[in-house]
């Protein structure tokens, strides 16, 4: 074979945000045949050539980017796309609220706001879908999602978390679940497909206007200014409805 | 080489404050949580404190929570235990250790003594 | 407190009040030292001498030193993080 060999997937089960002390599974998946996995969590020094590990109790210094390799012969493999293990459950729960209030008529604006007692710059704000409810969120910096011209597709249950950008992998535990309801349509709310899309961005101007809308079932971001965004890779894997464990700090 | 120095260990009164300090090198600090470990020869090696690395989360021992603070300066490679309302069972050798589970590096340690 | 004489294998035990599954390190100290880390998750290994091994999982685990070096007297100690963050007594090491 000439060239390195194709890069592994690495997946984390049941997903990747874990509640502190409950399970999960990190997982590398390359060709059949490989003669040696190699697992690291980077910015550290540490590694395991295995291609499974099992954390049996999430703890917070084991959140952060992980990544992994094979080895066939004496060839190594291009290394997999990042993936990012983040705790939740490190900070108490922030409070989601929806300005002027959750009910809105079809073709109004709404503006979801999560609110922390903590100075956090950072929050995340997700839908919950069918048939796999908690998907990955998508980041922004600022704590208010504004909604303009809401559709039928806006109904559902939002939750968002707070984070500090110092610690970005260490986040709250979930807000209590706000229900949007769309009135004055009779068209069925879309649901989130099993595997969206992952266009997360990370802004890097923090005062830029975020526009949340949701088309064609998949989140996307849409913004009034020049803003810098780097696309990162998906880093949930498709699998059956996850269940989230929350505890305070 | 990874080098952790502790100081501001001492002699102290009952209820009285100190303030411990670690200065790191040989390594990226901030990519790393740190901790304090203390052992006392009646108790043996006892964690204390950790603080993430970025340092927004912190958590301390039920024994010495609402008494002591640890914290971080990334921009110094310090790490910073304060430690107030002082008692005779926190008399023990104090240690600045990488990690947060494990303990990877430790520093020499240094020695604080609470009595009257 | 353990003797052994030099060359001698040598195996620590340390059990856990519950099980920890392979959050397990175990240390070492010399006289008027800091620990030392030697090994984590039960049985990584860090940088330390190979004679150093560790195995179990659970409740249960073990330190084995192949054979016992006069700079191996001291004291040794496993620390469980599963569960908060707990340190055993420890096990002084000397020679016979």
């Known amino acids: 074979q000439s060239g390195p060999l194709p890069k592994p997937s690495l997946q984390a089960l049941p997903s990747s945000l874990v509640p502190l002390e409950k399970p999960v599974t990190l997982r590398c998946q390359g060709p059949p045949g490989v003669d040696l996995y190699r697992l690291e969590k980077l910015s550290s020094s540490r590694y395991q050539d295995q291609a499974v590990l099992f954390i049996p109790a999430m703890k917070r210094s084991l959140a952060g980017r992980y990544r992994c390799s094979y080895q066939n012969g004496s060839l190594w493999s291009l290394p997999s796309d990042q993936l990012e293990l983040v705790a939740t459950g490190v900070f108490a729960k922030p409070s989601l609220s929806a300005q002027p209030g959750p009910a809105v008529s079809s073709g109004g604006d709404v503006t979801l706001q999560c609110q922390t007692r903590y100075g956090f710059d950072q929050f995340a704000l997700y839908k919950e879908g069918d048939p796999a409810p908690y998907k990955n969120p998508e980041r922004w910096y600022r704590a208010s999602f504004p909604i303009i011209t809401v559709t039928a597709a806006h109904s559902g249950t939002y939750r968002c978390y707070s984070f500090s950008s110092r610690d970005p992998y260490l986040w709250s535990a979930p807000s209590d679940p706000l229900e949007l309801v769309v009135t004055g349509t009779s068209v069925t709310p879309s649901r989130l497909p099993t595997e969206p899309p992952s266009p997360v961005a990370e802004f890097s101007e923090a005062t830029a206007e975020l526009t949340v809308s949701f088309t064609n079932e998949v989140f996307t971001t849409e913004t009034s200014r020049s803003i810098t965004a780097s696309p990162k890779e998906s880093d949930s894997p498709a699998g059956p409805a996850r269940q989230y464990y929350t505890k305070g700090n | 080489e990874v080098k952790l120095q502790e100081s501001g260990g001492g002699l102290v009164q009952p209820g009285r404050s100190l303030k411990l300090s670690c200065t790191a090198s040989?390594?990226?600090?901030?990519?790393?949580?740190m901790s304090w470990v203390r052992q006392a020869p009646t108790r043996g090696l006892e964690w204390v404190a950790s603080?993430?690395?970025?340092?927004?989360?912190?958590y301390w021992r039920d024994s010495v929570k609402g008494r002591f603070t640890i914290s971080r300066d990334n921009a110094k490679s310090a790490l910073y235990l304060q430690m107030d309302s002082l008692r005779s069972e926190d008399t023990a050798t104090y240690f600045c250790?990488?990690?947060?589970?494990?303990?990877?590096?430790w520093g020499q340690g240094v020695m604080v003594a609470v009595s009257s | 407190l353990l003797s052994a004489s030099v060359g001698d294998r040598v195996t620590l035990n340390c059990t856990a009040s519950?099980?920890?599954?392979?959050?397990l390190a175990w240390y070492q100290q010399k006289l008027g030292e800091a620990p030392r880390l030697l090994l984590y998750?039960?049985n990584s290994q860090t940088g330390i001498p190979s004679r150093f091994s560790g195995s179990g999982s659970g409740p249960d685990f073990t330190l084995t030193i192949s054979s016992l070096q006069p700079e191996d007297v001291a004291s040794y100690f496993c620390?469980?993080?599963?569960?908060?963050?707990?340190f055993g007594a420890g096990t002084k090491l000397e020679l016979k």
């Open positions: 519950q099980n920890v599954y392979k959050n």
């Open positions: 603080i993430s690395s970025g340092g927004a989360s912190a």
């Open positions: 998750s039960a």
């Open positions: 620390q469980q993080y599963y569960s908060g963050n707990t």
């Open positions: 040989g390594f990226t600090f901030s990519d790393y949580f």
């Open positions: 250790a990488r990690g947060e589970l494990d303990f990877d590096y």
